[in-house]
Interface confidence: medium
């Protein structure tokens, strides 16, 4: 048997490659219609949702999903055990933590049970599809008269994440942003004590453990300055 491992060419393209776009659907039988593309995201390596656009089908169809891992100990075909529904039609599958193997090629197959030959297979690198939870517990420490340090926590292995910090004052029209590596701390060397600052952070599973493109949600914002600075000049963790 061939033991090669399939690897996608870069990150998954999210364009609808599995929809027919070149000719009207009424000129083809259902059995030749391409199936919708499956998109999978691994949420904080706690569970994974694989979803598809069920409304792309010419008539309501409960498509079925099977999955396995290519060339591994987990290459036995598995049926989805927890379907997600949209208007009573299957539109996704949720896999639990024990079913997620980040560093093996994940193979997902969508099938029309009425037309068994109508099936499409996709291969995904799950380590590129991880979306961490938003950073938590933002705190600000005043390191000196004009220097602030922002710290936060993530509910995941810290060394696997990179971060994006955004901050602005009440006088600013746009955010200033700064990339931060796995150390999850950020220093602002020059702070104007007359202004009120707002900070927020998001995180991404990149580059040490994977090459994910999607960021987490933004953290709750934290504020510093003017109306708060007199209360405790050394520690602030005020959320909006």
């Amino acid at each position: 048997l061939n033991t090669t491992i399939l690897t996608p060419n870069g990150n998954e393209d999210t364009t609808a490659d599995f929809f027919l776009t070149t000719m009207p659907t009424d000129s083809l039988s259902v059995s030749t219609l391409p199936l919708p593309e499956v998109q999978c995201f691994v949420f904080n390596v706690e569970y994974m949702n694989c979803t598809w656009n069920s409304s792309s089908e010419p008539q309501p169809t409960n498509l079925t999903l099977h999955y396995w891992y290519k060339n591994s100990d987990n290459d036995k075909v598995q049926k989805c055990s927890h379907y997600l529904f949209s208007e009573e039609i299957t539109s996704g599958c949720q896999l639990q933590k024990k079913e997620i193997h980040l560093y093996q090629t994940f193979v997902v197959q969508l099938q029309d049970p009425r037309e068994p030959r109508r099936q499409a297979t996709q291969m995904l690198k799950l380590q590129n599809l991880v979306i961490p939870w938003a950073p938590e517990n933002l705190t600000l420490h005043k390191l000196s008269e004009s220097q602030l340090e922002l710290n936060w926590n993530n509910r995941f292995l810290n060394h696997c994440l990179e971060h994006l910090v955004q901050y602005r004052t009440d006088w600013d029209h746009s955010w200033t942003e700064q990339s931060v590596d796995y150390r999850h701390k950020f220093s602002l060397p020059s702070v104007d004590g007359q202004k009120r600052y707002t900070f927020r952070v998001r995180s991404r599973f990149n580059p040490l453990c994977g090459s994910a493109q999607h960021w987490s949600e933004w953290s709750h914002p934290i504020h510093w300055g003017s109306n708060t600075s007199k209360e405790n000049p050394f520690l602030f963790a005020l959320e909006a």
Epitope: L6, D13, D17, F18, T21, T22, A120, Q122
Partner: nanobody
Framework: EVQLVESGGGLVQAGDSTTISCVAS????????FGWFRQAPGKEREFVAT????????YYSDSVEGRFTISKDNAKSTVYLQMNSLQPEDTAVYYC????????????????WGQGTLVTVSS
């Protein structure tokens, strides 16, 4: 029903590059996903690469990843396999295959096949 004709095979020196082509006729080219498979003498047919209907998603076996590139020209109804840094182990008959529903690495999932083109890599 789509017909597939491969071309471009031949004798190549190790380390060199070549491109093989697959012209499709008799079907709506843009509605098909395509795959390249190969079969070396005395071995089973093995997956090489696959490309989706619109050409935006492609996959490779780990033995050719980084050396081979699959592409698709809908205007010319042609699929290409560009092969760089060829090695003697790449010697095989290369087959083009088409299917309706999306990329797949299993030969049994493909509906239509070409006759193959022989690529020989000499050391």
């Amino acid at each position: 029903e789509v017909q597939l004709v491969e071309s471009g095979g031949g004798l190549v020196q190790a380390g060199d590059s070549t491109t093989i082509s697959c012209v499709a006729s008799g079907g709506s080219f843009a509605t098909y996903a395509f795959g390249w498979f190969r079969q070396a003498p005395g071995k089973e047919r093995e997956f090489v690469a696959t490309i989706s209907q619109r050409g935006s998603t492609s996959y490779y076996s780990d033995s050719v990843e980084g050396r081979f590139t699959i592409s698709k020209d809908n205007a010319k109804s042609t699929v290409y396999l560009q092969m760089n840094s060829l090695q003697p182990e790449d010697t095989a008959v290369y087959y083009c295959a088409a299917r309706y529903y999306g990329v797949d690495y299993r030969s049994t999932s493909y509906d239509f096949w070409g006759q193959g083109t022989l690529v020989t890599v000499s050391s």
